[in-house]
Interface confidence: medium
């Protein structure tokens, strides 16, 4: 891990690209601009990464430390049940939903929330560090 810290965005962590944060053996990108879900997905894929898929509660709570009240798209969609972008099931957390048309997932510092996929939000990309 970089300079003894759990996570870092510093220049002394060459294993992640500029503007990406390293944690463990992964790199994370927190966007500033906003896009709809599919455009966010395509942004991540074009950068050799994927929309954030969270492995467990530990990773989720760590990432939430970096988030504000603003929601960020993650690689979660309701496709006959809530599943991550790769098709694996969401099984360690619940997701809050107000409507059946809210079929894409977003995260903020407090929770996972369903949203309409056409809404423009910030997003988080994730990839394995080199």
């Amino acid at each position: 891990l970089c300079q003894g810290s759990k996570y870092s965005t510093c220049a002394s962590c060459p294993s992640c690209p500029d503007h990406w944060m390293k944690y463990g053996n992964h790199c994370y990108y927190f966007s500033v601009e906003k896009k709809d879900w599919i455009s966010s997905l395509e942004f991540c894929l074009a950068r050799d990464s994927h929309l954030l898929m969270i492995t467990d509660k530990q990773e989720m709570s760590l990432l939430q430390d970096f988030l504000s009240e603003a929601f960020h798209w993650v690689g979660l969609r309701n496709n006959s049940g809530w599943r991550w972008e790769d098709g694996s099931p969401l099984n360690f957390s619940r997701i809050y939903s107000n409507s059946l048309v809210q079929t894409c997932g977003a995260i903020n510092k407090n929770s996972l929330q369903a949203s309409s996929c056409e809404v423009s939000l910030q997003w988080v990309c994730k990839k394995v560090s080199p």
Partner: antibody
């Protein structure tokens, strides 16, 4: 470089089970899911199931009652087992790595004939 | 289940000829999750085009892909001998994952 190497029997008796091991290198099973697909002259390419990086599994509903996929991350091995094989299960069985958004590397295939 | 129908089943082309094959889905598929694989006899399928139009590593630039919704296609701008193979479309959009029956491309 990324490799998936399969080992398993070529001939299986009807009603017996098929076991195939997929040993991977060049990537970790803790960060990539592994899918299983078979190919037969009659049915083409058929998706059978997947074991996700976190260890959970999903199966094609048509095979769920007789299919089991498990893995050993430390040995970089994925284990495929299908029970109660019949002659129409004769096919080439493949393991394939998932690297979003697609299965990008496939094993060499295990040719399985079900016959007495 | 999403059924993928490929056409034609078999086709032949001369060297230098432009080739187009199609893949039609029974229901809409996200272009991000529509892929093409190339397979030659005795070999495993190789990822050839991913997310509708992106060439996999090492794939010649004469290949291209396009489409959206339920209609997708793979095009070779100028046929070469090494392109003779079977091409399968595949959807990673919805479980169970499915593949087309393939288009076998032969050299005329």
């Amino acid at each position: 470089q990324v490799q998936l190497k399969q080992s398993g029997p070529g001939l299986v008796q009807p009603s017996q089970s098929l076991s195939i091991t997929c040993t991977v290198s060049g990537f970790s099973l803790t960060t990539h899911g592994v899918h299983w697909v078979r190919q037969s002259p009659g049915k083409g390419l058929e998706w059978l199931g997947v074991i996700w990086s976190g260890g959970s599994t999903d199966y094609n509903a048509a095979f769920i009652s007789r299919l089991s996929i498990r893995k050993d991350n430390s040995k970089s091995q994925v284990f495929f087992k299908m029970n109660s094989l019949q002659t129409n299960d004769t096919a080439i069985y493949y393991c394939a790595r998932l690297r979003l958004p697609a299965m990008d590397y496939w094993g060499q295939g295990t040719s399985v004939t079900v016959s007495s | 289940q999403i059924v993928l129908t490929q056409s034609p089943t078999i086709m032949s082309a001369s060297l230098g000829e432009r080739v187009t094959m199609t893949c039609t889905a029974s229901s809409s598929v996200s272009s991000t999750y529509l892929h093409w694989y190339q397979q030659k006899p005795g070999s495993s399928p190789k990822l050839w085009i991913y997310s509708t139009s992106n060439l996999a590593s090492g794939v010649p630039a004469r290949f291209s892909g396009s489409g959206s919704g339920t209609s997708y296609s793979l095009t070779i701008s100028s046929m070469e001998a090494e392109d003779a193979a079977t091409y399968y479309c595949h959807q990673y959009h919805r479980s169970p994952l499915s593949f087309g029956a393939g288009t076998k491309l032969e050299l005329k």
